[in-house]
Interface confidence: low
């Protein structure tokens, strides 16, 4: 998995009127990072693992440029035509990406009431834009605007990409970040479910990187995914990722019933509790 | 209407720097956005992308090549250049440049053909 | 750099044929994947841009799909003037390669 800074910028209008404020959150190898609340931008990290990736520092630097990229934004918002009246919102997501090859991928996308309309490679300064009347028309009205001064163009295109892999730089040499392999905690826990029958769920928490397998297994195989419901991956705020995958069992067979675990090359299984003990945690190195 | 013609010395001999011209009609090189390549074709070959340079004066070169390239602009002529130095019987191409506006070159000049021998 | 590999090197087919020619990079370039028509002795020309986007004045009887790492140029009724040699293009990252192409003739 590439490193990744994620820039997720909104302002509103309301009947063709920009509002003041904005929300700018800010995603750190898929982990949320910073917060900007809407009517005073103040970047606050998001749990102690943002807090540690730069250590006491105050966040001055990444309020201004998070409060500048938000009045940018408005500007823009301001210059599309024909705004209908009622609430209406433009999203600028912003990814810069550094692989393992240390090659770089960066890219723009703008998004009028959560429907996207205008996405730009920053490294090779490609526009691209879907085929509906709609998103060509939004996507001119955003372009001719940012074409209007060649300070504006400078921000929107040559900076923006060496900003965000600079940031990132940054952010990675805290060391923090580079933590690759932090293996799961696994939790199997059971519930009834109804008569005869048990729900057993399998947890998995606190690991990274966010790729996992995570199944349940009957006899040693695998059920069918039909039979098997699975929770998103979801950061927890610590940096790390939790999952779970839940299944329902005939209660007495819990012993036939195993979860399987695979992360960054390793593997466990951890079996049903049976009786009454609700939780049996199992964490490998 | 959109116009680019290559203009360049025909025949040089080996260790020479070719020095070619792009000039192009019909849209400006200062349109945010906007950006022109130079592409070359030996006979009876494929095409391969050489540099560019973009309406804020980035340039981008081929890695293959970069250390032998020079890629510059004259905004207000509507002119594009580049230069190739130590020339050898490789180079031999027809050399094209192209208008790269979102992501994919549109236009395509005429082309220009060299011939490097001794 | 991404490699673009074409497939056939050469496809000799009848008029009115329904033809397809074959893109792959070496890696996955989502849809950023232009598609070049070059006849004898002229310049190259602008067939299909982004995998499947349509070029206003190219007949619509060439099409494109795929994206990621495999792509498709399609002729539905070959035509005389088709015949020329078909270069696909990685628009994705620099440098920007193109295929070693597949030429085109009539049997």
């Known amino acids: 998995e590439p490193h990744s800074l994620r820039y997720n910028l909104t302002v509103l209008s309301w009947d063709g009127s920009v509002q003041s404020g904005f929300l700018t959150e800010v995603h750190l190898d898929g982990q949320p990072f910073l917060r900007c609340d809407r009517q005073k931008c103040r970047a606050k990290p998001q749990g102690q693992w943002a807090e540690d990736v730069l250590g006491n520092k105050t966040w001055d630097r990444e309020t201004r440029d998070l409060t500048g990229n938000g009045k940018d934004l408005r500007m823009t918002l301001a210059h599309i035509k024909d705004q209908k009246e009622g609430l209406h919102s433009l999203q600028e997501i912003r990814v810069c990406e550094i692989h393992e090859d240390n090659s770089t991928r960066s890219s723009q996308h703008f998004y009028y009431d959560g429907e996207l309309f205008l996405s730009q490679n920053l490294e090779t300064k490609e526009w691209t834009m879907p085929q509906s009347s709609r998103a060509q028309t939004l996507a001119m009205n955003v372009r001719n605007f940012l074409k209007e001064d060649a300070m504006k163009t400078k921000t929107h295109y040559h900076a923006m990409h060496a900003d965000c892999l600079q940031e990132l730089r940054r952010y990675l040499k805290s060391g923090v970040v580079l933590r690759r392999t932090v293996p799961p905690m696994v939790n199997v826990t059971r519930s009834e479910a109804s008569e005869g029958n048990i729900t057993v769920t399998c947890r998995a928490s606190g690991f990274y990187p966010w790729n996992i397998t995570l199944s349940w297994r009957q006899d040693g195989v695998s059920l069918s995914h039909d039979t098997q419901q699975w929770g998103d991956v979801l950061p927890d705020g610590n940096g790390t990722y939790q999952t779970w995958v839940a299944t329902r069992i005939c209660q007495g067979e819990e012993q036939r019933f195993t979860c399987y675990m695979e992360h960054s090359g390793n593997h466990s299984t951890h079996p049903v509790p049976s009786g009454k003990v609700l939780v049996l945690q199992s964490h490998w190195q | 209407q959109v116009t680019l013609k290559e203009s360049g010395p025909g025949i040089l001999k080996p260790s020479q720097t070719l020095s070619l011209t792009c000039s192009f009609s019909?849209?400006?090189?200062?349109?945010?956005?906007?950006?022109v390549g130079w592409i070359r074709q030996p006979s009876g070959k494929g095409l391969e992308w050489l540099a560019h340079?973009?309406?804020?004066?980035?340039?981008y070169y081929n890695p293959s090549l970069k250390s032998q390239l020079t890629i510059s602009k004259d905004t207000s002529r509507n002119q594009v250049f580049l230069k190739i130095t130590s020339v050898d019987t490789a180079d031999t191409a027809t050399y094209y440049c192209?208008?790269?506006?979102?992501?994919?070159?549109?236009?395509w000049g005429q082309g220009t053909t060299l011939t490097v021998s001794s | 750099d991404i490699v673009m590999t074409q497939s056939p090197a050469t496809l000799s087919v009848t008029l009115g044929d329904r033809v397809s020619l074959s893109c792959r990079a070496s890696q996955s370039i989502s849809d950023y994947l232009h598609w070049y028509q070059q006849k004898s002795h002229e310049s190259p020309r602008l067939l299909i841009k982004y995998a499947s986007q349509s070029i206003s004045g190219i007949p619509s009887r060439f099409s494109g799909s795929g994206s990621g790492s495999d792509f498709t140029l399609s002729i539905n009724s070959v035509e005389p003037e088709d015949v020329g040699v078909y270069y696909c293009?990685?628009?994705?990252?620099?440098?920007?390669?193109f295929g070693s192409g597949t030429k085109l003739e009539i049997k």
């Open positions: 340079i973009w309406w804020d004066d980035d340039r």
């Open positions: 019909g849209f400006s090189l200062s349109t945010s956005g906007m950006g």
């Open positions: 192209a208008r790269r506006l979102n992501g994919y070159f549109d236009y």
């Open positions: 293009q990685n628009g994705h990252s620099f440098p920007f390669t």
